[in-house]
């Protein structure tokens, strides 16, 4: 057969109108002409092309091809001639000040912040060579130089990740109901009930020893023990398996003896054996139909014509002559569009193709990173290149703790709290914000001073009942919180001075809340009877439900602003899922009763998702794209609840529309709230008033009663008819259609006044609930009965 790539020298053939005819008479899509790829394979599609000059930000390959400058010397050849990775190009490269050279034998530069971070980013590990000990005196330094609390050493778990914390340990004593394999010789510990059960569980088979079991051990003689029924096969390792499992290709015995000494697969006399060992009826051999999975029943039957010799079989790329007919195929990175023509595969359609940015090219794709991140050339994931090392901050009811994700050292940020569940941070100001459910207050402090009660500032302590979710808008300097007792969502300035209730209707059990100040949206979870995840503008307009099906107890939610996805954990379904910011492209990443036994908080950073689990009393992490690589970050935590990542890349800077306006605070008398950026015509912000006041006709000033002139001039999305309902004492209800910036009725006091004591619900263990139990039965009692607040755990 002729070379399938070159095509035949048969009669000339005209190409379709949207195709280009190569000199060798091949037809290629016209758009491939002058794209710097030799698609014709005789270079005729690249002849007579206008000369291309590379941009200043590009690298010019030796053959004139242009590639991004940052792809030069990155370990992958992007130039067709490989000149971007050549010795000549790369040895000239000097690493800039903020980068570290990987040594004289390498031309690779890595961010200086990756030096001594416990991960080998240079091929030879030069970035981790000669690093000083980082660990505190009470910590253990792992072989990979991460730090570990001393209590984790020799505890039977590989906490370091390289096994170094479990090397050279004295043999631990077996538990009270455990058996030591190999006598006292330091073997494994196995449950006592596994001893003398006719199955070898110890490597040395000591759990089935004759002297121990009072009978010949199943492996004591060369002959295996007889099985109970004739329909069973006796494994050499002692166990009995179904006789039908013998020689079935599956290893069912521990020692695989059910697949030993098996005859080679042969077909019956009236059958044909395919190349892969399967059998088909002999009459199907050479019947011009492919019956064997590998097509071998039709191999060697006909010596017919080679269609590939004529116009390459009509294939745009590769033509393969078959015994019957022919087949068009494509090179890597291309797919058949119409059985003959190859088109580029858009690998970027797969949202998980890259950890951040995916750029599709003809025949291949390339991953890139957002500013502030750099590609780790070993894992191909984007890693933070700027700023201090990221840390994970979490609450455990009585404390706020911090774990450095690079050094892995573990510290207490705020001790001696009463009942803290929700928290968030403001990275630029180094402040931490948290809610205490027992004291019914929202606090703030500088992180380095937060352990001192005198430095803890009370921001909100009025009309709070059960503030279970908290989020900081670091751009517009606001805090948002959910209150499951009052059934409200509120906003306040970060100093607590000005506040407003945004939502007080259609909330059942609001819990987690997250904000996207770059686009002007907030997101929250509600684990009430109609559990859902909702979204609205940061000013309370354009409320919409994103998830309402296959959702039961959504606890934590978090946003990945870069990939524009929302992640959440569901503690009833034991799932970790994600959706895009519009509620589409839903994915369940992990479904596990083990790792997601009772998840509560969730956070995302780089290529990982982190979550807390109340039942496991641990923090887990996994790959955020596929849910794989699940590992435990910390355990024995006693009620770990909310969790956030502290790193400057988690809170990118953006313009504050309220401060950019001609008038300070957007000209608003009270609150200036960012509006959702739905289109280029969206307003940048809207003004808001306290719960007892109304916006005036100028939409900026606040008045005690609606200004009569303004009732009909307002945006319909904001207009609401205020119903005549029973209100808190002293509140006026105005029966008129009037725009009060929020989508809600203004109210003076919270739905449950802070002076009212709420009866305590009994503490019910989740495991005792029947499937029909209402979500609301799942309470965990607040320790401070005087306050009368029940904190409910979805």
């Amino acid at each position: 057969a002729a070379d399938p790539l070159l095509g035949g020298q048969g009669p000339a053939k005209d190409c379709e109108k949207d195709q280009f005819q190569c000199r060798n008479e091949r037809c290629i899509p016209s758009v491939w002409r002058c794209d710097e790829d030799d698609d014709c394979l005789d270079h005729s599609d690249e002849d007579d092309c206008p000369k291309k000059t590379c941009a200043d930000s590009d690298f010019t390959c030796d053959n004139g091809h242009c590639i991004h400058e940052r792809w030069k010397c990155d370990g992958e050849e992007e130039c067709p001639d490989g000149s971007d990775e050549s010795e000549a190009t790369c040895t000239k490269q000097v690493c800039p000040a903020e980068k570290l050279s990987c040594g004289p034998t390498s031309h690779k530069c890595v961010p200086a912040s990756w030096r001594c971070d416990g991960e080998k980013d240079c091929e030879g590990g030069a970035d981790e060579a000669g690093c000083a000990t980082l660990c505190a005196p009470h910590e253990f330094q792992c072989g990979n130089r991460s730090c570990l609390a001393a209590v984790f050493v020799c505890d039977g778990d590989d906490d370091c990740g390289d096994g170094s914390d479990e090397r050279g340990c004295a043999d631990p004593a077996c538990g009270p109901r455990e058996f030591r394999c190999g006598g006292d010789g330091g073997g494994a510990c196995i449950p006592e009930r596994w001893v003398c059960d006719r199955q070898f569980d110890c490597e040395d088979r000591s759990d089935e020893a004759a002297e121990l079991c009072g009978r010949p051990g199943p492996g004591a003689t060369s002959a295996p023990a007889a099985c109970a029924t004739a329909s069973q096969f006796a494994c050499r390792s002692g166990e009995c398996v179904h006789l039908g499992w013998r020689c079935d290709g599956d290893r069912d015995c521990k020692d695989k003896s059910d697949e030993a000494d098996c005859p080679l697969g042969t077909c019956r006399g009236d059958e044909f054996q395919c190349g892969d060992g399967t059998c088909v009826l002999a009459i199907k051999h050479c019947n011009q139909e492919q019956d064997c999975p590998d097509g071998s029943d039709e191999a060697g039957c006909l010596q017919g014509l080679n269609e590939c010799l004529h116009n390459n079989g009509g294939c745009s790329h590769i033509c393969t002559d078959l015994k019957i007919g022919f087949e068009c195929t494509c090179p890597a990175g291309f797919q058949l569009l119409d059985q003959k023509t190859c088109g580029d595969i858009d690998e970027c359609k797969d949202p998980d193709a890259c950890s951040q940015i995916c750029v599709n090219y003809k025949g291949y794709f390339k991953c890139e990173c957002y500013p502030g991140y750099e590609m780790d050339l070993l894992t191909k994931n984007c890693k933070a290149a700027a700023g201090k090392s990221p840390s994970l901050i979490f609450t455990n009811r009585h404390e706020v703790r911090r774990i450095d994700l690079v050094k892995r050292n573990y510290s207490r940020l705020i001790p001696m709290l009463k009942n803290v569940v929700a928290l968030d941070v403001e990275v630029a100001t180094n402040r931490i914000y948290w809610c205490d459910l027992s004291y019914r207050k929202i606090y703030s402090a500088y992180m380095d001073k937060a352990s001192d009660p005198k430095e803890q500032e009370v921001l909100i302590d009025e009309q709070l009942h059960s503030p279970e979710g908290l989020a900081v808008d670091w751009v517009h300097k606001h805090i948002y919180w959910t209150d499951s007792g009052n059934k409200t969502i509120s906003v306040a300035t970060v100093d607590g001075g000005r506040r407003r209730t945004l939502f007080s209707r259609n909330l059942s059990e609001p819990r987690a809340i997250a904000v996207d100040p770059l686009r002007g949206f907030m997101y929250w979870s509600d684990w009430g009877d109609q559990a859902k995840i909702e979204k609205s503008g940061l000013n309370g307009v354009d409320r919409q439900t994103l998830v309402s099906d296959n959702i039961e107890w959504p606890n934590g939610i978090t946003l990945d602003l870069l990939s524009q996805r929302l992640y959440w954990v569901d503690s009833k379904l034991h799932q970790l899922s994600s959706i895009d910011f519009s509620g589409g492209n839903r994915k369940t990443l992990i479904s596990s009763t083990d790792f997601l036994s009772h998840p509560f908080g969730i956070a995302v950073f780089e290529d990982k998702v982190f979550w807390t689990d109340l039942e496991n009393e641990a923090i887990f992490s996994a790959n955020r794209l596929n849910g794989l690589e699940i590992s435990i970050l910390a355990e024995n935590l006693n009620n770990p609840h909310d969790i956030v990542i502290f790193h400057e890349l988690k809170q990118p800077r953006a313009p504050d529309a309220c401060e950019l306006s001609v008038q300070p605070n957007g000209g608003c008398e009270y609150l200036c709230l960012p509006a959702p950026q739905i289109s280029s015509h969206s307003p940048k912000y809207t003004c808001a008033c306290p719960d007892t006041m109304w916006l005036g006709p100028d939409m900026k000033r606040c008045y005690r009663a609606p200004q009569s002139t303004s009732t009909t001039t307002l945006a319909s999305t904001m207009t609401r008819t205020v119903p005549a309902t029973t209100r808190a004492p002293g509140t006026t209800v105005h029966r008129s259609t009037y725009q009060n910036h929020s989508t809600e009725t203004p109210s003076l006091t919270a739905a449950v006044p802070s002076s009212v004591s709420v009866p305590r619900a009994p503490s019910i263990s989740p495991s005792t609930l029947s499937p029909a139990t209402s979500n609301h039965s799942q309470h965990y009692a607040n320790e401070d009965s005087k306050m009368g607040s029940t904190v409910t755990a979805a």
Partner: antibody
């Protein structure tokens, strides 16, 4: 109609203590921050204390911090100001004021005179 | 803390005059300034808030303006009941609350 009526003033010896009261009516007292503002004879106005709606937090300028204590009883719609270690410069008319939702003082009492003698 | 410097301390005027009082803050106060009138032996009365918003019972001859650090209060056509002391107040929802030193409007 909003009404604020102060009481408890008078002539007091330097170094002694005094407790002023303010009775509020005509509005839901428990929904508002309340404050005390004083005015020395022939002088300007000076803010001296503010208390939150529930009474859980209070604020003072540095000039009186440690000596003045503001408190409230929402059940009685009453506001109080305890002044300890009275000094001659505490001689002033003390006004009870309501802090409106937007932050300014929107209603005032008629004031009560405190004179500190040496 | 923010200081409010009010001037002049006293302002002689005749009936029908237009008078202006100024208040300068030690830093930008984002228009959060209120103006009060006080007559001898009486409590202060709120006239203007948020730089220029007149209270519902404030006559229209009173006005306010300003931004940043500099603010002014005017009476366009002085009437006999306007002779009193006037105070500016920088307010916010959190402390401190700072008054200007006051201006006494007197009959010339």
């Amino acid at each position: 109609e909003v009404q604020l009526v102060e009481s408890g003033g008078g002539l007091v010896q330097s170094g002694r203590s005094l407790k002023l009261s303010c009775a509020a009516s005509g509005f839901t007292f428990s929904n508002y921050y309340m404050a005390w503002v004083r005015q020395a004879p022939k002088k300007g106005l000076e803010w001296v204390a503010t208390i939150t709606t529930s009474g859980s937090r209070s604020f003072y300028p540095d000039s009186v911090k440690g000596r003045f204590t503001i408190s409230r009883d929402n059940a009685k719609s009453s506001l109080y100001l305890q002044i300890n270690s009275l000094k001659s410069e505490d001689t002033a008319t003390y006004y009870c004021a309501r802090r409106g939702p937007l932050g300014y003082f929107d209603h005032w009492g008629r004031g009560v005179m405190v004179t500190v003698s040496s | 803390d923010i200081q409010m410097t009010q001037s002049p301390p006293s302002l002689p005027a005749s009936l029908g005059d237009k008078v202006t009082i100024t208040c300068q803050a030690s830093q930008n106060i984002n228009k959060y300034i209120a103006w009060y009138q006080q007559k001898p032996g009486k409590a202060p009365r709120l006239l203007i808030r948020f730089t220029s918003t007149l209270e519902s019972d404030t006559p229209s001859r009173f006005s306010g303006s300003g931004s940043g650090r500099d603010y002014s209060f005017s009476i366009s056509n002085v009437e006999s009941e306007d002779f009193a002391s006037y105070y500016c107040l920088h307010y916010d929802n959190l402390p401190p609350w700072t008054f200007g030193g006051g201006t006494k409007l007197e009959l010339k």
